[in-house]
């Protein structure tokens, strides 16, 4: 069977098409190409006659198209117009005719695209953009890229006029990128040239560095402020409410006690209309920032009770410190046998009971720091208790009377290793 | 009705030179490839320039570039082919085509100019 096939189908303007003939009978006397999907005189492009090898133009013939002897057509130098149907006549020697009818669609070579905004300096939070890829083509289709990744799904993007607009609602700084837009049609792909997006922000609430708090007099105080802003922000300092200078770095060399105070870093952008301040609390004194970590010593740490008594001392080289003791996590003294002395450098425990056995340690603290001591484990034992009286089971030592101990402890079980280990030395 | 006329063919001694034209009705020259076929007896047809205006590409046989050069004058409609240093073996009739831009491929219809080299 008779066919056409378009190479290619799709068609660029500016190029050319082959209407490719299949299947074309022995014994031909000549044929004959028409535009459109039937035979039609008035619509003839080109007719050929095999014996004298004679190409004819017809009344549609343009000078653009080429017939083949094999029957194929080539039409150069495409326009829009030339898309549709092309039908060929065949003659054959005994004058029976046979058509087919193939077809081709011809598309712009695309320009390439440029991104127009509705707003060259959107503000953060406030704004929303409106980037249009230009020219309107038709049959083409539209493509964004950011950063050259493809959209990103979010909410605050929205594409619309058949993707040839993209809109972003409420931009943020992290919007700020490097915008293309891409126009694609069956024959051609173009990207325009990035468009960059300066998204106008802050300033967020300043940081002032460094950290530090507190100074010693004679030192040098430098102090500079930073806020995220676009543009950048401009910076002033003012002390206790009182403005200094308009300067992102603030210097006050050698200074003293009098130079305490709230230091207010204010950051302004000028083209957003915002400003943000952050007060900084400085204190200038002798007094050690940091404390050292202080010892405790102790007369013993393994006490007989109710006959010895114990002195703990808190060691720190730092002056201007004052020391706190603690037991078990409550404050001391908590008894009229513990009395602290030396400004409470040393505890004292006289007599030393059973209860008072366990951790201690110390704390040494002046107004802008403190440190406190790894603790220190106290024991307490009772002397150890006859031989008669005590019977081992399952290496747990019971009172067995005689002694008047058993009005006191009730015969319990106690775990008594310290009176155990005694008893079996003087074995 | 679309028709091609040729023009500008005679007797001339080697070495002369002719100019031959094509005057172009029923379709604008600018949008296609023109060119120029010669046939000769006893030899094979040959393709010996084309020009295609709408691109501005020219194209030439080897065995004659370098002493023809084919033009268009669109605003006439018409192309040209100057012949220089012309040889015996260029002797034929000359028809004006329309032309592939890119394939060995064309079609003619006119009459031809008949070009003589002789001494």
């Known amino acids: 069977k008779l066919t056409i096939e378009s190479t290619p189908f799709n068609v660029a303007e500016g190029k050319e098409v082959l209407l490719l003939v299949h299947n074309l009978p022995q014994h031909l006397f000549g044929y004959s190409w028409y535009k459109g999907e039937r035979v039609d005189g008035n619509r003839q492009i080109i007719g050929y006659v095999i014996g004298t090898q004679q190409a004819t133009p017809g009344p549609a013939y343009s000078g653009r198209e080429i017939i083949y002897p094999n029957a194929s057509l080539l039409i150069q130098n495409i326009i829009q117009n030339d898309t549709g149907f092309y039908t060929l006549h065949v003659i054959k020697s005994d004058l029976v005719n046979e058509e087919a009818t193939g077809q081709f669609r011809v598309y712009p070579e695309l320009p390439k695209p440029s991104i127009s905004s509705n707003n060259s300096k959107p503000v953060e939070d406030k704004d929303a953009v409106a980037f249009t890829c230009e020219p309107e083509t038709q049959d083409a289709t539209y493509l964004w890229w950011v950063n050259n990744q493809s959209l990103p799904v979010s909410p605050r993007l929205q594409l619309s006029n058949g993707n040839r607009t993209l809109t972003l609602f409420n931009v943020t700084r992290n919007d700020s990128a490097s915008y293309k837009c891409e126009t694609q049609n069956p024959v051609s792909a173009r990207r325009s040239d990035s468009v960059i997006l300066n998204v106008l922000y802050g300033p967020d609430t300043p940081t002032i560095s460094p950290s530090d708090t507190y100074y010693r007099p004679g030192a040098n105080l430098s102090l500079s402020c930073y806020a995220a802003s676009n543009p950048p922000a401009q910076y002033s300092w003012l002390i206790n409410g009182t403005f200094q200078q308009s300067t992102q770095e603030l210097f006050i060399p050698n200074i003293t006690v009098n130079n305490s105070g709230s230091y207010t870093c204010h950051a302004n952008n000028s083209v957003t209309g915002c400003n943000r301040t952050t007060v900084k609390t400085i204190i200038v004194t002798e007094l050690s920032p940091v404390v050292a970590k202080p010892q405790i010593k102790a007369s013993k740490t393994t006490v007989t009770g109710d006959k010895d008594s114990v002195n703990l001392t808190c060691s720190t080289n730092d002056t201007g410190i004052s020391i706190r003791w603690f037991f078990k996590n409550q404050s001391l003294p908590s008894s009229e046998r513990m009395k602290l002395s030396q400004g409470n450098i040393t505890l004292s425990i006289n007599p030393v009971k059973r209860e008072d056995a366990g951790t201690y340690w110390c704390e040494v603290f002046n107004p802008i720091s403190k440190n406190q001591s790894d603790p220190i484990m106290l024991n307490v034992n009772y002397n150890a208790l006859p031989q008669e009286n005590l019977i081992n089971v399952d290496e747990q030592l019971y009172f067995q009377g005689g002694s008047g101990l058993n009005d006191i402890f009730e015969a319990q079980k106690i775990e008594w290793h310290e009176a155990r280990a005694h008893h079996h030395h003087h074995h | 009705e679309v028709q091609l006329v040729e023009s500008g063919g005679g007797l001339v001694q080697p070495g002369g030179s002719l100019r031959l034209s094509c005057a172009a009705s029923g379709f604008n020259i600018k949008d296609t490839c023109i060119g120029w076929v010669r046939r000769a007896p006893g030899k094979e047809e040959e393709l010996v320039a084309g020009i295609c205006e709408y691109t501005g590409s020219t194209r030439y046989a080897d065995s004659v570039k370098g002493r023809f050069t084919i033009s268009a004058d669109t605003s006439k409609n018409t192309a040209y082919l100057q012949m220089n240093s012309l040889r015996a073996e260029d002797t034929a009739v000359y028809y004006c085509?329309?032309?592939?831009?890119?394939?060995?491929?064309?079609?003619?219809w006119g009459q031809g100019t008949t070009v003589t080299v002789s001494s």
């Open positions: 085509a329309i032309v592939s831009q890119s394939r060995s491929v064309y079609n003619y």
